[in-house]
Interface confidence: medium
């Protein structure tokens, strides 16, 4: 649907993307799956996350942030070895305020790169971007004073994922607009990995029967479940190995006792 970004180079800055498809707008597609993907944003010159619906869309879509950066950012591989001192702000902290398409009135917080502070803004309830936090504290923790962590930069202590308005999850009504809402995720102090690893297994809404794995934060193990092919949440992996690799790293060991809290 979205082809190349319809903008001139002068509007976008001087950087030319490595491939023409890197200039395409993120295209979630007309389907209902919820697949975490990455695209290169011509406006911010960064790779950013979006939710892909599972069909159609375009070539500006990558399974990993790394793959996106390698493909679309000139000279990325040369500069990829960064100084390990201190933590970096996740890319989404630099996104512009985006209230989204819907007409709700939700008090949220965003990181303002001009003032270098977290500030209040009004979120409409759907779409928007990930520079969107439910509490000031959460915003500060992630964008103002990021904590150094061994896990990849863009995956540290993320707040509940702000869903794209296309995802098939719980729904509620805000100001007479029916808005898909992100599933409520329990906040756990002993887990500092990806928040979707805390979500319960969700079979989704379709009729297929696919073998998948989900991370059980209570047992610290990945278990099998049947996925119906669309909807559901991101605690959904095609192999046990991928599941463990993605979620196991977030557990924090209690050093004095040597056990998982």
């Amino acid at each position: 649907l979205s082809e190349e970004a319809d903008d001139t180079d002068s509007e976008l800055g001087s950087m030319k993307p490595l491939h023409t498809f890197c200039a395409m707008k993120a295209d979630d597609g007309p389907c209902k799956a919820m697949i975490r993907s990455y695209f290169f944003n011509m406006y911010t010159h960064q790779c950013e996350e979006f939710i892909y619906g599972g069909c159609e869309g375009n070539e500006n879509r990558f399974d990993t942030l790394e793959e996106c950066k390698k493909t679309c950012i000139p000279g990325y591989e040369k500069t990829a070895v960064k100084a390990a001192s201190g933590a970096e702000r996740p890319d989404f902290c630099f996104l512009e305020e985006d209230p989204g398409l819907c007409r709700g009135y939700m008090k949220r917080y965003l990181y303002n790169n001009q003032t270098k502070q977290c500030e209040r803004f009004v979120y409409g309830g759907c779409l928007g971007n990930r520079n969107n936090f439910e509490t000031l504290d959460e915003c500060k923790k992630i964008c103002e004073n990021p904590v150094h962590s061994p896990s990849p930069v863009n995956e540290v202590q993320m707040s509940d994922y702000v869903t794209d308005g296309n995802t098939v999850t719980d729904r509620s009504t805000v100001n007479n607009i029916v808005v898909p809402q992100s599933p409520k995720v329990p906040r756990r102090r002993d887990y500092r990995g990806r928040p979707w690893c805390l979500q319960p297994a969700d079979s989704g809404l379709c009729k297929a029967s696919e073998r998948r794995f989900y991370y059980n934060s209570a047992t610290g193990k990945c278990h099998r479940f049947n996925y119906t092919g669309c909807g559901g949440n991101n605690n959904n992996f095609t192999t046990r190995r991928r599941c463990l690799r993605s979620c196991k790293t977030g557990l924090i060991k209690n050093k004095s006792k040597g056990v998982v809290k």
Epitope: L1, E3, N166, R171
Partner: antibody
Framework: QVQLVESGGGLVQPGGSLRLSCAAS????????MDWVRQAPGKGLEWVSS????????YYADSVKGRFTISRDNSKNTLYLQMNSLRAEDTAVYYC??????????WGQGTLVTVSS | DIELTQPPSVSVAPGQTARISCSGD??????AHWYQQKPGQAPVVVIF???NRPSGIPERFSGSNSGNTATLTISGTQAEDEADYYC?????????FGGGTKLTVLG
Amino acid sequence: QVQLVESGGGLVQPGGSLRLSCAASGFTFRSYGMDWVRQAPGKGLEWVSSIRGSRSSTYYADSVKGRFTISRDNSKNTLYLQMNSLRAEDTAVYYCARLYRYWFDYWGQGTLVTVSS
Amino acid sequence: DIELTQPPSVSVAPGQTARISCSGDNLPNYYAHWYQQKPGQAPVVVIFYDVNRPSGIPERFSGSNSGNTATLTISGTQAEDEADYYCQSWWDGVPVFGGGTKLTVLG
């Protein structure tokens, strides 16, 4: 506010040609996919053609493929539909519509094309 | 090709609930959108992405999509809701419309 105004409809003989125009205003025309949708008298909506993105990728319904050509002039904020080898079954009101993501959020009022001898 | 099937007509008494269905093999995986068209007028979107109502559309319009069937529900139907209703989805890169349903408000 967003406005779409179609023109160019009229009476044409079978085998003849006609060019429809859709003048757009109130939005950044080049940033949106644009489509033609038609409606035969007393019948339902039928998607005809799409043009999307700055590369102007084009798509056509099987019923018009090879006979109709969609195009756009972003400098004039205008969408076109060149219709050749017209048939009686092409008789319809032709609407231009703005494609927002995967649905049509704005429609013109339509222009009537009558193919008859 | 995918077909979206709608009942040709639905009748409802004023104040009652009207349900218009749209079935298609692609609907378990694809979103449905709904348009209202009154005689001599262009269509207007009343529901997008299965359940979302654009601003300006009355609260009595709602949508759902489960399995092979998307449904447009009009609760407390009013005389002004009498119109043709079309579902629209997507297939193979292009939009697809249902055949349309004429909603008649009795009395």
